[in-house]
């Protein structure tokens, strides 16, 4: 019998009955064995078929078989109820080999022409399976010429049997205080040949509780305990299980913070698996009782490990840990059932004793010594000599612990000295230099350095003077001996002040005229204001209306008198303002250089002479009475004049202070 072609030869060809296309002879038996490469099958179809028809093809027939299985026994020309002819059918081998047998018996009633068939090898699609048959692969099947291979979905790995997909279900660690875990694919059937390990790992102090929920279906056996698939639960204390079957296991209180769940499946079965909801518990901490005037948040029925609460105080109360202030407070429950922090208190805010007000006083309004939340105090300044600047002096203890004014300021009010107060009122007539009486010129300052000079007190820590009077001491301010509150130049009874800094106008040039002859001395301490020490006012914008030609100003000082000596007692003189052009003209003649009198100067004195300031008066104030405010202000600073004081036709020249208000204000605000 011909074997037919064998792989690796090309596997295709033609088969025919002996003598085809002529009739075949009696008593013929012919057998062909066709073999295809592995992974291929053989396809066979007939182009001609004409055999004697007999019951169940007992006489003449063509038999197709593959391995042990007969695929078909064929005879006749067309199929009947009991016999089959190939017609247009195509026949396929079950494996890679196909046996074809032709047989004719001892006689034919008429001639039959036999058969002609063609065959070829073709790839088997192993991925195609008949309905009801097990799939070739668990997940994905991939056909290729001569074979196939399987692959798995994400989260699975191909088993060594090359067909089953085992779940990659180990190494999952659950660290939350509660959660859910289930068999792979739950509630769909779980995968075969898998070994899953799940860990629940909570912080020490927690105890894990396991509840099986919804459904439980793990392959079981009627006699043996979970021989196929099983679920086991292991803690550091004990093992629970194995579990299988269809009954939900009971709750498991593990009394452990770590749990390992193992699930093992075999190669067969179709079961939906399991689902576990886990929770945890721990030793509760004592219930936090809110301190008076405070509340706890969040409010819970109980607080266990890692639970926390915060304390919030009512407005006007503050968190205090004993005496220590806290902005916020949160306590956390520990594994031993204690809170990690001691409970603070909500204490009423205490602003404490109010700061002393320089040159003022404070009065408790709410009650003697009451300094707690919403308490009210009233600051006031020492009457007559001080006035309150900025606010009304009423302060309230606010929730932030600070005394706060009605304008929201937390700084103290300021008691500013009242300026321009004098015991003297101007008489309006001009008369000779006179001795000053106590309180007449309380702004008068005696400056002793290299020479004797004067100045005028501004506020309670500045002295206004002439630049030329303090020029030599500009770099050694501490060398200036500043005295006030006395009439007698040589008296041991005076208020001593010391200079912190000297500010000479940047436009002043020493020994080159007296333009910008103005300076400020900052005192290193504030002086106490009283009837003998009071600052002079600075001129208001409207002050020029009190400083017109012939208006009377008053100059005071310890300068040279008519006898040529420094005065022992403070002297003063009332003198009129001189027309500026007239004064300019008086100093145009030699020995005075042209332009000696500038717009920054004003002149005062009598044309007839005799009333003037002199050497030793330099830096002192020429003051005027503001009739609207009834306060004295400084209009001029004693600067220069004729060589012979009080000379007829010559006048005293004073620095015009109103021109320097911005400069004065800038220096004082900056320093």
């Amino acid at each position: 019998t011909p074997l037919g072609p064998k792989w690796p030869e090309p596997v295709f060809g033609r088969l025919a009955s002996p003598g085809f296309p002529g009739e075949y002879a009696n008593d013929q038996e012919r057998r062909w064995t066709l073999t295809a490469p592995p992974g291929y099958r053989l396809r066979l179809y007939f182009t001609h078929f004409d055999l004697e028809l007999s019951h169940l093809c007992e006489y003449d027939f063509v038999k197709l078989s593959s391995g042990a299985k007969v695929l078909a026994t064929l005879c006749g020309q067309e199929s009947t109820d009991t016999e089959r002819a190939p017609g247009k059918d195509t026949f396929y081998s079950l494996g890679s080999s196909l046996d074809i047998t032709f047989r004719s018996d001892y006689s034919n009633e008429k001639p039959f022409t036999g058969f002609e068939a063609f065959y070829a090898a073709e790839d088997i699609d192993e991925c195609q399976v008949a309905p009801g048959e097990a799939p070739t692969c668990d997940h994905h099947c991939h056909n290729h010429l001569g074979g196939f291979y399987c692959s798995c979905r994400a989260g699975y790995v191909l088993h060594r049997n090359k067909r089953t997909c085992s779940a990659l279900c180990s190494g999952q660690v659950f660290t939350q205080r509660s959660g859910e875990l289930s068999s792979p694919e739950y509630p769909r059937p779980y995968p075969k040949l898998s070994s899953c390990t799940y860990s629940i790992s909570l912080e020490e102090g927690f105890s894990v509780i396991l509840d099986f929920v919804e459904s439980f279906d793990v392959e079981t056996h009627p006699e043996t305990l979970c021989p196929y698939d099983f679920l086991k639960i292991q803690t550091d204390r004990e093992e629970h299980g194995p579990f299988c079957g269809k009954t939900l296991p009971h709750r498991i209180e593990t009394k452990s913070n770590t749990v390992t769940i193992t699930f093992v499946t075999d190669e067969s079965g179709d079961h939906t698996g399991w689902k576990i909801h886990y929770t945890s518990t721990a030793q509760p901490c004592p219930y936090p009782m809110a301190p008076p005037n405070g509340h706890v948040s969040p409010v819970q029925a109980k607080y266990i490990l890692k639970d926390s609460f915060s304390i919030f105080c009512e407005t006007g109360y503050e968190l205090l840990q004993g005496h220590l202030p806290l902005k916020s407070f949160t306590a956390v429950c520990q594994k031993d059932g204690s809170w990690d922090r001691p409970m603070p208190a909500c204490s009423i805010v205490d602003c404490g004793p109010p700061d002393d007000l320089p040159s003022g006083r404070v009065e408790y309004i709410t009650g003697p010594g009451v300094t707690t939340y919403k308490a009210v105090i009233q600051y006031s300044c020492e009457e007559t000599f001080y006035t309150m600047k900025v606010n009304d002096g009423k302060y309230v203890c606010e929730a932030d612990g600070f005394w706060t004014s009605s304008k929201g300021e937390k700084s103290l009010p300021v008691c500013e000295p009242v300026c321009g107060l004098s015991a003297r009122t101007t008489g309006g007539r001009i008369y000779g230099g006179q001795k000053a009486k106590p309180g007449d010129f309380p702004w008068q300052v005696l400056i002793l350095g290299g020479t004797t000079a004067a100045g005028a007190l501004l506020y309670d820590n500045w002295v206004l003077t002439a630049a030329h009077a303090v020029y030599e001491q500009k770099h050694d301010a501490s060398a200036l001996d500043i005295r006030m509150g006395t009439l007698k130049r040589l008296s041991p009874h005076y208020t001593q002040a010391w200079s912190e800094a000297v500010f000479i106008h940047e436009g002043y040039t020493h020994d080159a005229g007296f333009d910008n002859d103005i300076a400020l001395i900052k005192l290193n301490n504030k002086v106490v204001i009283n009837s003998n020490i009071t600052p002079i006012c600075l001129p208001r914008k409207e002050a020029e209306s009190f400083m017109r030609t012939d208006d009377i100003g008053t100059a005071s000082g310890w300068g040279l008198t008519q006898r040529g000596f420094l005065a022992r007692n403070l002297m003063y003189v009332d003198i009129p303002i001189v027309d500026h052009q007239k004064c300019t003209a008086a100093y145009e003649k030699p020995p005075y250089p042209r332009g000696s009198v500038t717009a920054n100067m004003l002149c005062a004195g009598l044309e007839s002479g005799g009333k003037d300031s002199c050497r030793g008066d330099s830096g002192g104030a020429l003051v005027f009475l503001d009739s609207e405010t009834e306060r004295w202000f400084v209009g001029g600073i004693v600067s220069w004049g004729s060589m012979n004081c009080g000379e007829a036709g010559q006048y005293g020249v004073y620095t015009k202070v109103i021109n320097y208000i911005p400069w004065i204000e800038n220096i004082i605000s900056d320093f």
Partner: antibody
Framework: EVQLQESGPGLVKPSQSLSLACTVT?????????WHWIRQFPGNKLEWMGF???????NYNPPLTSRISITRDTSKNQFFLQLNSVTTEDTATYYC??????????WGQGTLVTVSA | NVLMTQTPLSLPVSLGDQASISCRSS???????????LEWYMQKPGQSPKLLIY???RRFSGVPDRFSGSGSGTDFTLKISRVEAEDLGVYYC?????????FGAGTKLELK
């Protein structure tokens, strides 16, 4: 972690003022808690001087109230000690520290101040 | 002022010994809020003091569990279960319940 560092002159003349700064890193002095000054005299006796709170309020050891001032500069995260009219009795190592539920959990390394003419 | 009295002033020990330091206050340290603000500090030469224990028995972070504090009212104790070389130094008790807050004079833990 919070760190504190004291700085200031090591020598002060009697009757003058002692001024020290404490520079804080790793935590804002306005965020919470109290910020303290403590001193340790020769012989190791420790004395709490006072504190300034996160809000800027102060609390002083009563015997020192008339001559102590604790202030701060929030922009530089520093707080300061000024002790006026010092005498040789004020010679000590001065520490700054931070509180919590305890008084002095975090300390600076300390700075020695000698009061001497 | 609350006076804090420590005993002994000097405590000679061998490494591995248990050490116990006592502190007594001149008045109760129970604050009006119910807490007791008693603290223990330890200082080594040339270093700043370090907090060990607060509110009588709470250990500060990083403090080994061989240190423990106990007591109530006016009597308090610091115990070191097994003394190690790094534990040698001066120990101070401190009260924060009453202002002005005050320290004890110190107990020197030294080797025998």
């Amino acid at each position: 972690e919070v760190q504190l560092q004291e700085s200031g002159p090591g020598l002060v003349k009697p009757s003058q003022s002692l001024s020290l700064a404490c520079t804080v890193t790793g935590y804002s002095i306005t965020s919470d808690y109290a910020w303290h000054w403590i001193r340790q005299f020769p012989g190791n006796k420790l004395e709490w001087m006072g504190f300034i709170s996160y809000s800027g309020r102060t609390n002083y050891n009563p015997p020192l109230t008339s001559r102590i001032s604790i202030t701060r500069d929030t922009s530089k995260n520093q707080f300061f000690l000024q002790l006026n009219s010092v005498t040789t009795e004020d010679t000590a190592t001065y520490y700054c520290a931070r509180s919590y539920d305890y008084w002095f959990g975090y300390w600076g390394q300390g700075t020695l101040v000698t009061v001497s003419a | 002022n609350v006076l804090m009295t420590q005993t002994p002033l000097s405590l000679p020990v061998s490494l591995g010994d248990q050490a116990s330091i006592s502190c007594r206050s001149s008045q109760s340290l129970v604050h009006s809020n119910g807490n007791t603000y008693l603290e223990w500090y330890m200082q080594k030469p040339g270093q700043s003091p370090k907090l060990l224990i607060y509110t009588v028995s709470r250990r500060f972070s990083g403090v080994p569990d061989r240190f423990s504090g106990s007591g109530s009212g006016t009597d308090f104790t610091l115990k070191i279960s097994r003394v190690e070389a790094e534990d040698l130094g001066v120990y101070y008790c401190f009260q924060g319940s009453h202002v002005p807050v005050t320290f004890g004079a110190g107990t020197k833990l030294e080797l025998k």
